[in-house]
Structures are given as structure tokens and as C-alpha cells.
């Protein structure tokens, strides 16, 4: 069972001094900040017993395994149900405390009732302040039964519950009709899931025979020991004032555990500490009685004396619960009450015994839960004891349960049962998560859900390049921290797996599923510089750049050109996907705009250093295209062009530009300026005879405008080859006159 205790301080003279403390003896309990241990919760449960609202209660955490509830301002704040929740995962356990008002009309003779399935439970409410009205019994807040006030027997109202079943468990209350619910007697009924002395899914397993008032847990067969007792069967008493599964906790205050109620996981419930009794746990046990609530009787033999905390204290030469066993009878010594091993291990178990005659190797045997008897492989004989060592065959899950060490001599026999827990090493259910990556390192979160048993003692991360047959590299990490895998190869896939371990030999679990994590490319280091740029139009810019010469292959996939339009707050990015490129034409720019320009090398998703920036001013956009361009051959070397001025001009034209190109030719076109913008005609001279030419033109105001349509015309034949076209222009009318 989970080591969880809810302590209620019952010194009720002042509710403001009242407190509840929940103490966990579980490893890592209450930390809450990591995934391995949820926090302890301590709260009032108002679902069944509703009290008038008051100031909120104060919760204080004292270290990792203790939480205290204070801030009760009036007695009614105390009445009701409180619960503490602790333990992790499937072991998460709720411990419940029910508080009754000392001034209630009805008081419970006994608050906690633990009964077996099929038993008859009897709840008894004692009349404290009589009212001549009906008594209403409720179960978990809902009406359950009515008694006429005449039905009281010896000043008590009894509720008989025959053949109880686990669903009957819960909070019961007895209240006078017309009385405040706070004047009720509140009870807690715990119905074990099995009949007496049985546990397990089909109630087929036999309980270990819990001593000193311990209660056998119906799910796992463990004894839930009363406060002040320990051991597999609660056979050992703690020192006075101590509690917890290993007697590790100490009652607060100078008067020890006086005035404290202890609540433990079901099916135990609540009781006073060992040596105390009464509704407020302030009365010491009467002579001859001991234990929690003083429920146990000493009945010491052979001169033993009764200690109200631990029971019989035996004189020299005697031992046993009632000092009934002579020291001549062999006795198992210092056997651990609980041992834990990992699945498929082959542990060694030691069992020591003393007696007269002295036990020898063959007289000590070990019995497994399935009845198999193991004989010791060796024994160490010392003056005061013999220690037998047993080599246990490979453990399976079915070996979990109660084992027994037994010693037999002619002087008699003794046996000691102990619990063996076979734990399953943890196996990750998921692959680790990649958090960030660089060219030579991966940052990984190893924290994954797992099957099997905790706690997790170590986490190993195994990794190697994908498709590699080389040995795995391994790193041992803290379970709660992220891990950085370093000195990796860039642009390489790595197979990464988690392996979890729990404490003890053989606690390493199988490796979890692999995941592929890929390192980034190496960062490009070369810084380009801009060689130059020129404007090829109002919205076109040709840029060229260079890189420093370095030995070895170029680390890069291409270039990124960035143009920043500061006026509009816009960035234009142009990707040049060849690392060999050293020039690019940027089109679709905004005419008349001032750009800041830079270039940087990229590799995969990583960018190298940017070039020093350049500042470029694009000319404003030009006028519309001239209209109705027409070409007419005049001779074997002359062609006349005529046109109409563009429409909707934004200002006066400064010149026209004519583009001349031989049709089907591979050479660059020739551009000829017409510097008299009022002209609508020009003659292109110096052309080759019998040659077909293409013409188009555009106007310029502050910047060049759009091209006109292209026209074709051939010069007349059989002339001499000209030196090249030249231009002569005049008004169209004048040309026509000539």
C-alpha cells in the first residue's frame, strides 16, 4: 500500500489551532514539478457534508512529502470530510478523514467501520443532545433510512446493514429531523472487496494474517498496518511516537501522538495512534491493553509485561507476541519484511536463524508463493546465528507475493513470511522528442511515457548514424533534463533510442522505439560583396557579385538577394538557386524607389553573412508607348519610320529611343535617340540592302517609357553594304513633301 498518512489534531479548544497534515513516505512524493511524482493534495470535500462558506483554508507545503491545512475559523469549519491524495499513477491513493462536531446532537460510537464483503455492519449513533424527532440516516448525502425517536436502544440509534457489498462503502450520517446537518453523527464504512482473510481478483488468495490490528488489502494482499506498527504482517512495533510504514515519521509536539487521529489508506481507515484511545485520542490505554485505539490485549505469559505502545515486553529467554516462545525454539532473525527484485533476475536471498540446538544449513528452507521449496546453496555459521543463502531461479511475475523462510530443529520451528515484489523494468512507449538541431548537435527530450515499473533511476540515450553498423554511442542522463548530443556530423540522420532503468540488478529495460533525427547543414561562412549593378529599366535591375576565393568545395546551395524598400517598409527576396551564379536580373521592382541591396550565401536553411549593403535608386516610370508606328523603305539603305505621340503624357517628352534589329539576327539590337521630341517621323540610314529589319520605339520623360509595337520592313535591293544605320528625322509633313 502507499505510505500515506493523514493526521488530524483533535485538541479542539480552539478551532484556529486545528490542523490536518498529510505525510507521504513515498520516494519523491509531492514534488509535482517533474513528471515522476504528482503533488500531494489535501482538501475539504464538500460534496456530501456542506458547511456554510467561510474564509478559504490555507495550504502549506513542508518539504516534498508533507502538506498541512490550517485556517479554520469556527467549529463548523471542521465538520465534514477531508481527503489527502498521494502516490503516482496506478498507486494514486486517497486517504479520508471524517470529522464530527463534539457538540453534535448525535455522536458516532466508532467513526470508521472496516468490514468484509458479506458481513453485517452496525453503525451506532449515541444520543448526545436528545430531540424527540425522527432520526434520518443518509448514505453519501442521500436519504437511506428513518428511525422513529422511540427506536433508540440504550441511548443509541443503530443502523444495521446486512450482507454489505463494496458499493455500500461511503460516508453515512445520522441526523435528527429538523436539525442542522452539522449536528449529525458522521461515519465511514469501508467494505473490503473480499470475504475475511482473502484477497485478489477472485478473492482466491489468502491474506498473510495481519497482526496488531493490521488490515489485509483486498487488491494486493499487503497488510495496512496501524500507526505505530511495521513489517509485512505488522509484527513489529515502532518506538513510541513514531509512525509510517518504516516508522520513519515522528509525531509532532512534546506529548507524542496524544490527541492525533491517524487515517491510512483503505481498507484501514482511521484510528488513534498506538497507546491512545477515546473520541479525541487523549486517553491512555487501560492496563493490559495496547495498540491503536487500545484495541489489543497483551495477555503476556512467562513474566512478560504489557507496554501500551508495543505489547508484551518479554524477559530474557522468551519471545513471541505473548512471550509464549522459549528462546530454545529456533527463531528467524532480522528478516526484511519486503524485498524487491527485477523480472528475470536470479537474486540471492539470505535467511538467518538462531536457536538451540543450533540451526544448520539443511534445517533452513525457502518457500515460494506457488509452494516450491528452495534449499540453501551455502550457509555461513557464526557463533550467534546461521545464515542460509538461497540462489533463486530466474524470477517471473508470478513469483510476486508472500515467500516464507522456515527453520526446523528438534527444538521446534519458526517461520517468517516476507513480501517479494517482482518489478518489470521500464520500457519506453515512445521515441524521444527532438527539441532543436544544429549542424553538429541535437537537443533531445528523453522524458517519455513507459510501461513497466518505476521509479526511473537512469535514462540512457543510444544514438548512431542512420543505416550505420557501427556501435551505438550511449549517454547517461538525468531523467528530468534535456540532453544535448554533441560532436555529430552535419546533414546526417541519426537513429536515437531511449533506454530506462529502475533500481536494482537487472533493472535495465528494453530499448524504446527508434526515431530519426537529422543534423542541420554546416553554416555557410563566406561573405559575398556586390561587384556592381545597373538599371535596365524603371523596374529592372541587374546585379553582380563575387565571393572570396578559398580552397576546397564551396559550402552553399545558392544566393539570397534582399532588397529593402525603406519607404514602404517592404522586403523583396530573390532566390538564386545556383552556387555558381554571380549575376541576377531583378524584375518587377517599383520605379522611382530607393532600395537597399545585399546578397548572402545560403546552405540548406542556413544563411551566411550578408554582403555590405548597396543603395540603388530606380528611375521613375516613363511615359506610355508611341502609337501607330509604321515603317516604309525609301531606298536600299534607308527606311522611314512614322508614329503618333503617346496619349495622356505626364509631362513633356525629352526624346524618343528607336530600337533597330535585323530580323532573325543573333546580335544585340541598336538603340538610336531621336533628340527632337516634337518630331513624328525619322529616317534610318546606313542600312543593308535587301535586308529585313525590326523596329520599335519608346519615349522618355524622366525615365524610359513602354515600347511601342514592333514593325518590320525590308530595304530595297542591290545596293552596296552600308556601314550601319544612322538616323535623320524631320516632321512627317516635311518628309511627305519631299
Amino acid at each position: 500500500a502507499v505510505d500515506l498518512t493523514l493526521l488530524a489534531n483533535l485538541r479542539l479548544t480552539d478551532p484556529q489551532r486545528f490542523f490536518l497534515t498529510c505525510v507521504s513516505g513515498e520516494a519523491g512524493a509531492g514534488r509535482g514539478s517533474d513528471a515522476w511524482g504528482p503533488p500531494l493534495l489535501l482538501e475539504k470535500d464538500d460534496r456530501i457534508v456542506r458547511t456554510p462558506p467561510g474564509p478559504p483554508l490555507r495550504l502549506a507545503r513542508n518539504g516534498s512529502h508533507q502538506v498541512t491545512l490550517r485556517g479554520f475559523s469556527k467549529p463548523s469549519d471542521l465538520v465534514g470530510v477531508f481527503s489527502c491524495v498521494g502516490g503516482a499513477g496506478a498507486r494514486r491513493t486517497r486517504v479520508i478523514y471524517v470529522h464530527n462536531s463534539p457538540g453534535a446532537h448525535l455522536l458516532p460510537d466508532k467513526v470508521t467501520h472496516t468490514v468484509n464483503k458479506g458481513d453485517t455492519a452496525v453503525l451506532s449513533a449515541r444520543v448526545h443532545k436528545e430531540k424527540q424527532t425522527d432520526v434520518i440516516w443518509k448514505s453519501n448525502g442521500s436519504y437511506f433510512y428513518t428511525l422513529d425517536w422511540h427506536e433508540a436502544q440504550d441511548g443509541r440509534f443503530l443502523l444495521q446493514l446486512p450482507n454489505v457489498q463494496p458499493p455500500s462503502s461511503g460516508i453515512y450520517s445520522a441526523t435528527y429531523l429538523e436539525a442542522s446537518p452539522l449536528g449529525s453523527a458522521f461515519f465511514r464504512l469501508i467494505v473490503r472487496g473480499c470475504g475475511a482473510g482473502r484477497w485478489g481478483p477472485g478473492c482466491t488468495k489468502e491474506c498473510p494474517g495481519c497482526l496488531h490490528g493490521g488490515v489485509c488489502h483486498d487488491h494486493d494482499g499487503e497488510c495496512v498496518c496501524p500507526p505505530g506498527f511495521t513489517g509485512t504482517r505488522c509484527e513489529q512495533a515502532c518506538r513510541e511516537g513514531r509512525f509510517g510504514q518504516s516508522c520513519q515519521e515522528q509525531c509532532p509536539g512534546i506529548s507524542g501522538c496524544r490527541g492525533l487521529t491517524f487515517c491510512l489508506p483503505d481498507p484501514y481507515g482511521c484510528s488513534c495512534g498506538s497507546g491512545w484511545r477515546g473520541s479525541q485520542c487523549q486517553e491512555a490505554c487501560a492496563p493490559g491493553h495496547f495498540g491503536a485505539d487500545c484495541r489489543l490485549q497483551c495477555q503476556c505469559q512467562n513474566g512478560g509485561t504489557c507496554d501500551r505502545f508495543s505489547g508484551c515486553v518479554c524477559p530474557s529467554g522468551w519471545h513471541g507476541v505473548h512471550c509464549e516462545k522459549s528462546d530454545r525454539i529456533p527463531q528467524i532473525l532480522n528478516m526484511a519484511s519486503e524485498l524487491e527484485f527485477n523480472l528475470e533476475t536470479m537474486p540471492r536471498i539470505n535467511c538467518a536463524a538462531a536457536g538451540n540446538p543450533f540451526p544448520v544449513r539443511g534445517s533452513i528452507e525457502l518457500r515460494k508463493p506457488d509452494g516450491t521449496v528452495l534449499l540453501s546453496t551455502k550457509a555461513i555459521v557464526e557463533p550467534e546465528k546461521t545464515t542460509a543463502e538461497f540462489e533463486v531461479p530466474r524470477l517471473v511475475l508470478a513469483d510476486s507475493g508472500f515467500w516464507e523462510c522456515r527453520v526446523s530443529t528438534s527444538g521446534g520451528q519458526d517461520s517468517r513470511r516476507f513480501k517479494v515484489n517482482v518489478k518489470v523494468p521500464p520500457v519506453p512507449l515512445a521515441a524521444p522528442r527532438l527539441l532543436t538541431k544544429q549542424s553538429r548537435q541535437l537537443v533531445v527530450s528523453p522524458l517519455v511515457s513507459f510501461s513497466g515499473d518505476g521509479p526511473i533511476s537512469t535514462v540512457r540515450l543510444h544514438y548512431r548514424p542512420q543505416d550505420s553498423t557501427m556501435d551505438w554511442s550511449t549517454i547517461v542522463v538525468d531523467p528530468s533534463e534535456n540532453v544535448t548530443l554533441m560532436n555529430l556530423r552535419p546533414k546526417t540522420g541519426y537513429s536515437v533510442r531511449v533506454q530506462l532503468s529502475r533500481p536494482g540488478e537487472g533493472g535495465e529495460g528494453a530499448w524504446g522505439p527508434p526515431t530519426l533525427m537529422t543534423t542541420d547543414c554546416p553554416e555557410p561562412l563566406l561573405q559575398p560583396w556586390l561587384e556592381g549593378w545597373h538599371v535596365e529599366g524603371t523596374d529592372r535591375l541587374r546585379v553582380s557579385w563575387s565571393l572570396p576565393l578559398v580552397p576546397g568545395p564551396l559550402v552553399g546551395d545558392g544566393f539570397l538577394l534582399r532588397l529593402w524598400d525603406g519607404t514602404r517598409g517592404q522586403e523583396r527576396r530573390e532566390n538564386v538557386s545556383s552556387p555558381q551564379a554571380r549575376t541576377a536580373l531583378l524584375t518587377g521592382l517599383t520605379p522611382g524607389t530607393h532600395y537597399q541591396l545585399d546578397v548572402q550565401l545560403y546552405h540548406c536553411t542556413l544563411l551566411g553573412p550578408a554582403s555590405p549593403p548597396a543603395h540603388v535608386l530606380l528611375p521613375p516610370s516613363g511615359p506610355p508607348a508611341p502609337r501607330h508606328l509604321h515603317a516604309q523603305a525609301l531606298s536600299d539603305s534607308e527606311i522611314q519610320l512614322t508614329w503618333k505621340h503617346p496619349e495622356a503624357l505626364p509631362g513633356p517628352i525629352s526624346k524618343y529611343v528607336v530600337e533597330v534589329q535585323v530580323a532573325g539576327g543573333a546580335g544585340d539590337p541598336l538603340w538610336i535617340d531621336v533628340d527632337r521630341p516634337e518630331e513624328t517621323s525619322t529616317i534610318i540610314r546606313g542600312l543593308n540592302a535587301s535586308t529585313r529589319y525590326l523596329f520599335r520605339m519608346r519615349a522618355s520623360i524622366q525615365g524610359l517609357g513602354d515600347w511601342s509595337n514592333t514593325v518590320e520592313e525590308s530595304t530595297l535591293g542591290n545596293g552596296l553594304q552600308a556601314e550601319g544605320p544612322v538616323q535623320e528625322s524631320r516632321a512627317a509633313e516635311e518628309g511627305l513633301d519631299q
Partner: antibody
């Protein structure tokens, strides 16, 4: 589903006797206090008698005391009302009713009623 | 003679609100907060509508509400609907550990 079904009503002469039954289902009959309530023609409701779950304690309205007897058989989930020395003023529809104590309440309320059975006392 | 006094009849149009009063004494209505109201359609079983003066059992519409002042308890039905037409009875626990009912009020939805 909680159900209460009365039977046994009918026409009877003054001074005569009748035994009413109420069959209960859908709840743990043996845990509940049960009532008989009646309604005379054109009149309001009037509580007649009550019996505690154990059957050991019974109470009656003054108008029927000494003439009517309430009883129950928890093994049969049935409530009874034995009516003797009937009078004309006992003519009414007789309802059996269950009481409960709602959460957070300190009193009983009639949470389920039967459809009623008519008793006519006339010569 | 009934120990709790109710008006014999009340009427209202659909959508309107109506209030039915129930007057008792210090030994019942004013002495306890244990007043309840029952709705009774003739030929059917009565139905608990309110308990502890103003609490509604689950399944009862929130159009039904209750209050108490001195020795008079009241049932208010808002947003009147045709199916609300029925007889309504108030009831109170008494100091003599008995129950008293009102004479009933016939609610007509016009």
C-alpha cells in the same frame, strides 16, 4: 423507475371494512417511511397515517385513530391500510406516498405518489 | 377545515406570472422552513414541485419559484403555460410531527 400502485378501493356501507394495498417497485422499499394521504371529493389533501421502515412505529391522523391500521410487508414490497368502522366522511381517493429527505434538507417530503384508489362509503 | 389557507382559484394568460399564497401559523409555516408545493392534475399522481420553501427537485422547471414571509408562503409560476393548469397544494411540517395541507388552488390558464 419508482412506482406505487394502489388497489382495494370500492363501495362499502357505513360501518364496513376495506383493506387497501400499495405495491411498490423501483426502490429499496424497506428503507423508506410510507404514508397514506386522502382527498375527499372537491376537497384538499389530508394525511391519514404513516409507518416507519421497520414497521414497528405507526402514527395516525385524529380523524382515523382507532379505526384504521397501517402495516407493511417489506419482503413483498407492499404497504397496507386496514379501514374498519367506515364512515361517509371517509369517502375519498386514497393515495400511498413515499417520503424522502432531500440533500441539504432537514425534513421529509412526499417525492413519489401513486395514482390513488377511490373508496366510497355509502348506504 | 384545512390548517393552511389557499385561494380557491387563480387564473392567468399564457406568458404571464401568477402567485398562489398559503397562510398558516407559527406552529407550521412560520415556525419551519419545511414548506412544500405539489401539483395535481386530476386523475394523476400529485407531483412535488418545491421543497424547503424554495428548492426545486431535479426535473422541475425553473419557472416555478417559492418564497416565505412570516406565516405566508407563496408559489410563483412565471411564463405561464397551458400544461401548468392543475390544482396546487401547499404543505408544511408541524410542531406536532404531522403534516398539514392547504385546501388547494385551482389554476386556470386562460
Amino acid at each position: 423507475e419508482v412506482q406505487l400502485l394502489e388497489s382495494g378501493g370500492g363501495l362499502v356501507q357505513p360501518g364496513g371494512s376495506l383493506r387497501l394495498s400499495c405495491a411498490a417497485s423501483g426502490f429499496t422499499f424497506s428503507s423508506y417511511m410510507m404514508f397514506w394521504v386522502r382527498q375527499a371529493p372537491g376537497k384538499g389533501l389530508e394525511w391519514v397515517s404513516r409507518i416507519y421502515p421497520s414497521g414497528g412505529w405507526t402514527y395516525y391522523a385524529d380523524s382515523v385513530k382507532g379505526r384504521f391500521t397501517i402495516s407493511r410487508d417489506n419482503s413483498k414490497n407492499t404497504l397496507y391500510l386496514q379501514m374498519n368502522s367506515l364512515r361517509a366522511e371517509d369517502t375519498a381517493v386514497y393515495y400511498c406516498a413515499r417520503v424522502t429527505v432531500p440533500l441539504d434538507s432537514g425534513s421529509y417530503y412526499f417525492d413519489y405518489w401513486g395514482q390513488g384508489t377511490l373508496v366510497t362509503v355509502s348506504s | 377545515q384545512y390548517e393552511l389557507t389557499q385561494p380557491a382559484s387563480v387564473s392567468g394568460s399564457p406568458g404571464q406570472s401568477i402567485t398562489i399564497s398559503c397562510t398558516g401559523s407559527s406552529s407550521d409555516v412560520s415556525g419551519y422552513n419545511y414548506v412544500s408545493w405539489y401539483q395535481h392534475h386530476p386523475g394523476k399522481a400529485p407531483k412535488l414541485m418545491l421543497y424547503d420553501v424554495s428548492n426545486r427537485p431535479s426535473g422541475v422547471s425553473n419557472r416555478f419559484s417559492g418564497s416565505k414571509s412570516g406565516n405566508t408562503a407563496s408559489l410563483t409560476i412565471s411564463g405561464l403555460q397551458a400544461e401548468d393548469e392543475a390544482d396546487y397544494y401547499c404543505s408544511s411540517y408541524t410542531s406536532s410531527s404531522t403534516w398539514v395541507f392547504g385546501g388547494g388552488t385551482k389554476l386556470t390558464v386562460l
